[in-house]
Structures are given as C-alpha cells and as structure tokens.
C-alpha cells in the first residue's frame, strides 16, 4: 500500500564544488519506526540480482555499521519524522540522484532526490517588475537556489559597479518546500537610472566574489527638457523680441507632442521646439515653459520668468484696517503695477504731502482721531513716475469723549421731588446709540440721554451716566444731595440700665439715624404736653406718677419726625394699703363678713399677710379674708401687709364690730 509512506522535500537541490548541501526532509511511515537507513548515490535496480547498485554514501543499519563517508554525509533525521541530510563539502561528482533507502518493521522504501552540483558557483537570478517607471518604488529581487547552514553566503547589489546605498532585505529558506537565498531591494529609480547596469553579486562570508547576474534598467520616464532664452536674463522692455528654445535631453519611450505654456495655460498654435515673441507687451510678462509628452506622460521644462519692464501704473492705497480704532496701529500699502518694482514713493494725507514717507508702506503705531481722512500715493521706478490714484479713506473710531452727567433741577433737591438728569458728551465716532445709568432703577427715560426720577428717595446719593457707541464712556458720578426730614426717630433709655424703680435717676435719649440738613431741634411730649427741647429727658428721682407714654420729635428745615410712643414704667413697693370691709364694719353674728386688702403697687402685690389686733398673723394669704359665719369673738382691729418684688407695705388698723343677733339676745 504505497500510501503508507509520505515524504516531503525539495525535488532538486543545487550547489557547487566545495560548498555544502542541506536537504530538508520529512517522512511518515504509518506502521512503525525506522529500522535502517541507507543513502545511495545514483541507485539503479538490477533486475537480475534483485539488488540496488550504486555508491552507498551513508548507512545506518540495525547492526550499527557506518561507512567512512559518514563524516562528509550526515543523516540528521530521526526514526519517525525527520529525514534531513547534510553533505559537507559537496563535490561535482555528487551530482545525480540520491536514494534514501529506508526500512521499517514491515516495509522498505526508496525515496529519490535530485542533486545538481556545478563546477563553479552558479549565478543568482535578478527578477525585475514588468515595467519600471521613474519615481515609482519597485522591488528588485535577486534569487539564488541555494542555502546551506555550513556555507554562509551574501548577496550584494551594485549599480554601475558601485554598491547601492538602499538597504536590502535578505531572506533564506531551508524548508521541505524550497531552498533558496533571496535579497530584496526597494528602490525608487530616477530617469537618470535608465540604461544603467544593476548587478547582484554572490559573495562568500568573507566578501569574496563567487558569481553574479546583471540587468540593464529600462526606466520609463517623461521627457526631460532644457529651455534656453534670448536674451538670457529674460528681461526686456515693451516692443522688444524674445526667442525661447526647448531641448529634449532624455525621453523613454520617444516623445510624441510639443507645446508651450504661459503661467500654466497652454499657448495656442505653438507646437514647435522654438517660441518667437515679437514686440512684446507688458501683458506677456509671466512664467514660460515647454511641455513634451510621451506614453508615460507630459514632461515640463523649468520655468523662464519673462519680465517686460514698464513705468508704474496709477496707484491705489490699501489700508489695514479701516475703520481703525483709536490707539491701534494702521498700515497703508501703496500698490502700483510696475517693472522693475518702484524704488520711491510719495504719500499724501488729505491732498497734503506727508514729509519723510518714501517707502511702499506707511505704519502709524498709534492712531488718533485727527489721522482720519484720505490717503493717496505716487510710485516711481527707473522708467518713470506713475499717477496718483483716487486714494483710500481712513475712518478712525473712538468712544464718546468728555461725557458728563447734568442735573436739570433747581437745587436743593428734596425727598419726593421729580429729578431730571441729562447725559452730555463732546464727540463720538460712530454716533452714540444708547445710554446707560448707574445705579439701575425703575426710572423713566423720556428721551435719549435724559433720565427722570419720580419721587426721589432720601437715599439716592449719586448718579452716573455712560454714552455708548461701540464702546461705553462713563461720566463721573454726580451727587444728588437729596434733603429729607430726620429718619428713624426713637426713644432710647440711657439709664438706669435695668428696670426703673421709684426714686431712680432716669435719662431718656431721642435718637435718629440721619438728617439732611444736619441742623435739628428736639421736642419731648407726654400725653400731649410738652416736656423739653433737648435731645435728653432727665428725672433726678422718678416717681410712680412719672410713668406714662412719652414721645420725642426731631425736626429740621425739611420737616419733623415723631418717634413711636414709648411707655415709661416705674416699679415701687405696695403703698396706700387699707382694709375695706363688706358689708360694713359692723356685722351681726352669723352673717358673712369680707375684709379686702386694697393697695397701689407696681408690679401688683404677689403675696398678702393678715394680722389681728394682737399682731398675730392669720393663716390667710389672699387679698380677701372671708369670715363666715362671723362670730362676736371676731370683733377687733385688723390690718394687712402686701408684698411685691420691690418691697412690702402695711395698712393702718381697721376695726370690725360683730354684734349679737336678736335670737342670742332673746335667749339671754
């Protein structure tokens, strides 16, 4: 069953005398490991003897016999996968067929590999792309069907015998599929490389020449041109003649068409290698070149700049930038077509010559309003002086100037008045379009720049306005100086610091927060009665009768303001105590009698004590003492004592008389 053995290796291997050969080889014998291996050189089967005739280069048998060739020929394989071989050195007479005779437990196999050994190192082979175009990167490949671990080689690229400076990438393959050494060189050929010789040189490890391959480069390129002009500097004056000639220095393939271009545009009916320009005008100034085409494409010559000279044309002024903002910088540029370029300039501002300005540009580092106006210029070259053009207008813009806030009212202004203010300015560019006011309020602006404040507040202190165009300019604030009656009038107790007790020294202060004008008068009043005209009201020794509701008034020339009523409270111990009796001081026994302890006290009496005629305190502590039923024994003098937080007071004695009832008298 021939499918049992599978071999993979290169079909033919190439080498030369004295080099070596490395034979990558794999196999698969499905029925077991390798038992013996013999390497034949040119094995031939002898039908008669049923044996293979040929040189045995290597033998590895069960009995381990190894021939002398073993040193030169090595089996580097194994018993089940690898059948790689090496012959080092390899000789010319090794050329031919190698037979790998292999034996497993159940089968024998002969695998044949061709070996081609040349007398001298064979040349590599250069592979070029089918077409090479200038400036297009190509890969040059140098391939040598040789690689051996024991014999290092190198491939070097030469252009016209000189090593190429581009880096080549060398790769080797020693696989069952292929054995080779390859060098790849990326290269962007120029038209000048056309026809040049490229060499791939095979060298040994020491750089010694072994063999080479050469190719001639066929670089397709557009025509390469040279342009010649008479006069050679290409500078003429109007009316002169000019001749230009186009020469082809190289073209691959041959050129097919010729044309001339001016400033990139093709000139009609100019299809020869010579261009004649007669009586040139300034419009014929420009960049000329010739264009010649082949199958690759068009090639252009270098440009010739033809200069037809003439005096300056009427000038124009360009302003960078208008309108200009005051304080910014401005540049004026005088533009005039001329050849050669103007060498001198004269500048005018509003028709008047600007002294010392002779350059193409005028630079003003800091623009002021007076710089506004019309700017014009005149250009001059060796052929003459140009005319002054229409000029350009410079507009200088600035914020409103000298802004003031003006009060229109007669002075002084009183709280509650209607106040009118106007916002004035001296000049502005562009015009003022709006106004702003500080502080902001719900105020009327009856017309642009006028502010009306209805019912002006006492605290409206200052007002400022701004006049605005593209910018806002603020005026200094103006003081309204609003006059008003005294504000926040109130009574304040200065002393004592604590509550007022009868007999204390007491001072009250009439306070106010502000007044305009500052000059004020004071008035004190109690229950509608005027008490004094000072800011303070003083009591040397306060009495309960001084208690009551006090107000103070403060007035100035604008008006007067009263404080809220302030209650003066005087604290004193119980006084004017007396015992009143109900229904009277004479009561019949058995009835009811009520004794009441009356007093005047602040704060009110909090505690009462009752005493009898023996100054014996009774077990009663309320304001009323009720005797029910009253007895004759209750007759006698009574008094009471009242106590509050300030102190105590006692009443005089009051006598209660209890008389017998008729029943009692009747029983007696």
């Amino acid at each position: 069953d021939s499918s049992k053995w599978v071999f993979e290796h290169p079909e033919t291997l190439y080498a030369w005398e004295g080099a070596c050969v490395w034979i990558p080889c794999t196999y698969r014998a499905l029925d077991g490991d390798l038992e013996s291996f013999i390497l034949f050189h040119n094995p031939e089967y002898n039908k008669n003897t049923s044996k293979f005739d040929g040189t045995r280069l290597y033998e590895s048998t069960k009995d381990g016999k190894v021939p002398s060739e073993q040193k030169r020929v090595q089996f580097l394989g194994d018993k089940n996968k690898n059948c790689t071989l090496s012959i080092h050195p390899v000789h010319l007479n090794d050329s031919g067929q190698l037979g790998l005779r292999m034996e497993s437990k159940t089968e024998k196999w002969m695998e044949r590999i061709h070996l081609n050994v040349s007398e001298r190192p064979f040349p590599p082979h250069i592979q070029l792309p089918p077409e090479i175009q200038e400036s297009q990167e190509v890969t040059l490949t140098c391939l040598l069907n040789f690689s051996c671990y024991g014999y290092p080689i190198q491939l070097q690229w030469l252009l016209e015998g000189v090593p190429m400076r581009q880096a080549a990438v060398t790769s080797t393959s020693l696989t069952i599929k292929s054995v080779f050494t390859r060098s790849e060189l990326k290269f962007s050929p120029q038209w000048s490389h056309h026809g040049k010789i490229v060499t791939c040189q095979l060298q040994d490890a020491d750089g010694k020449f072994l063999s080479n391959d050469t190719v001639q480069l066929n670089v397709k390129h557009t025509p390469k041109l040279e342009i010649k002009v008479t006069p050679s500097d290409a500078i003429v004056r109007e009316g002169d003649s000019v001749t230009m000639t186009c020469e082809v220095s190289s073209s691959n393939p041959e050129y097919t068409t010729v044309s001339w271009l001016k400033d990139g545009t093709s000139l009609k009916k100019q299809n020869t290698f010579t261009l004649n320009l007669r009586e040139v005008t300034k419009d014929q100034s420009g960049k000329y070149c010739c264009q010649v085409s082949n199958d690759v494409g068009p090639g252009r010559s270098e440009e010739v700049f033809l200069q037809v000279q003439y005096a300056p044309e009427p000038s124009t002024v360009q302003i960078l930038h208008s309108p200009a903002v005051e304080g910014s910088q401005v540049e004026f540029l005088c533009m005039s077509l001329a050849n050669p370029l103007p060498t001198n300039y004269t500048w005018y501002h509003n028709g008047k010559e600007m002294q010392g300005r002779t350059e193409e540009k005028v630079h003003i580092p800091k623009i002021l309003p007076w710089h506004a106006g019309t700017y014009s210029c005149v250009a001059e070259n060796i052929l003459g002086t140009g005319q002054r053009g229409p000029g350009a207008e410079l507009d200088v813009q600035y914020p409103p100037k000298k802004v003031t806030t003006v009060i229109q009212n007669p002075m002084p202004i009183r709280e509650g008045d209607t106040v009118t203010l106007s916002c004035n300015y001296n000049s502005s560019n562009p015009s003022v379009t709006r106004y702003e006011w500080k502080p902001h309020g719900a105020w009327e602006e009856p017309s642009l720049g006028v502010l009306k404040i209805q019912n002006v507040g006492w605290d409206n202190t200052t007002i400022a306005c701004a006049a605005c165009n593209s910018w806002c300019s603020w005026a200094s604030p103006v003081a309204l100086n609003v006059q008003y009656a005294p504000r926040d009038v109130r009574v304040r107790k200065i002393k004592p610091l604590s509550e007022i007790h009868s007999g204390n020294s007491v001072s009250l202060q009439c306070d106010f927060s502000s007044s305009h004008p500052k000059e004020v008068q004071f008035f004190w009043e109690k229950n509608g009665r005027l008490l004094g005209k000072e800011s303070q009201l003083n009591f040397d020794s306060i009495s309960p009768e001084d208690a009551g509701s006090y107000s103070c008034w403060v007035n100035n020339s604008i008006g007067q303001t009263a404080s809220k009523a302030w209650t003066l409270e005087v604290l004193y111990a119980p006084r004017r105590l007396r015992v009143s009796m109900s229904p009277g001081d004479q009561v019949m026994e058995g009835k009811s009698a009520t004794l009441t302890c009356e007093s005047d006290a602040n704060p009110p009496v909090s505690h009462y004590t009752w005493f009898d005629w023996n100054n014996q305190s009774l077990p009663y502590h309320s304001q009323k003492l009720r005797l029910e039923p009253v007895k004759v024994q209750h007759s006698g003098a009574y008094w009471c004592q009242g106590t509050n937080s300030v102190g105590k007071g006692r009443s005089p004695l009051s006598t209660l008389t209890v008389y017998y009832s008729p029943e009692t008298i009747g029983r007696r």
Epitope: D1, Y45, S50, K51, F52, R101, T106, E107, K108, R112
Partner: nanobody, 128 residues
Framework: QVQLVESGGGLVQPGDSLRLSCTVS????????MGWFRQAPGKEREAVSC????????YYADSVRGRFTISRDNAKNTVYLEMNSLKPEDTAIYYC?????????????????????WGQGTQVTVSS
Amino acid sequence: QVQLVESGGGLVQPGDSLRLSCTVSGFTSDYYAMGWFRQAPGKEREAVSCISSSDGVTYYADSVRGRFTISRDNAKNTVYLEMNSLKPEDTAIYYCAVDKPFYDGGYLYTCPVDFDSWGQGTQVTVSS
C-alpha cells in the same frame, strides 16, 4: 527468526518438468514478496520468478517466461515454482527468498530486494 525450507529439486532430462516448493515460518508480516533465485556454478545469482502476497503480481525472467509458473498458498505460507520444458541451462541451485514489500517512490517491486532471508537451496540438474 525467519526460516525457509525448499524441496522438489532433482535430476531430470531436458523437456521434463519439476515442481519446487518453499515453506516460510517466523515471518511476521501479512505482506511480503517471495521469489525463486538460482545460481549456476561460476555465475552471479539471478532472479527467476517472484510473486507479491498483497496483490498476486508475478515476475518472470525473460529466459523462463512461458515455461515456469509461480503460485502461492497464503494459508500454508508456501510458494511453488512449476518448471516445464526444462533445459540444460536451467541447471543451478534454486534458492527461495522472502522479504518485506519494497516501494520505490510509488512503485512496488514484485521480487524481494536486498533481502536477508534465504533458504538452504535445492539442486536442479537438467541433463540427458
């Protein structure tokens, strides 16, 4: 250890027939190539006829083709050589050989190649 035992040789007259048989023992593989070889005095050994066990393909040397027939009995591990119209030049010692199948690339050889296992031989003499 492979053993081959040949039998059937002898002295015959030209034009007679002989049948040689060879029995194999100790050969492990089911697949093999078996053949008859002869060596006349002073001459090199040559293949006479071979047979492949796997497919029964036969080989005959040009000098015996049409006169000799090779056959096998796989069950008995025996190969036979039927020799008719014997000639004096057929005189030789006839050896039986067996070996593993030999493949050269994809080609399978019918005869044993470089074989190791030999019989002791049987003498065939054709003489009038």
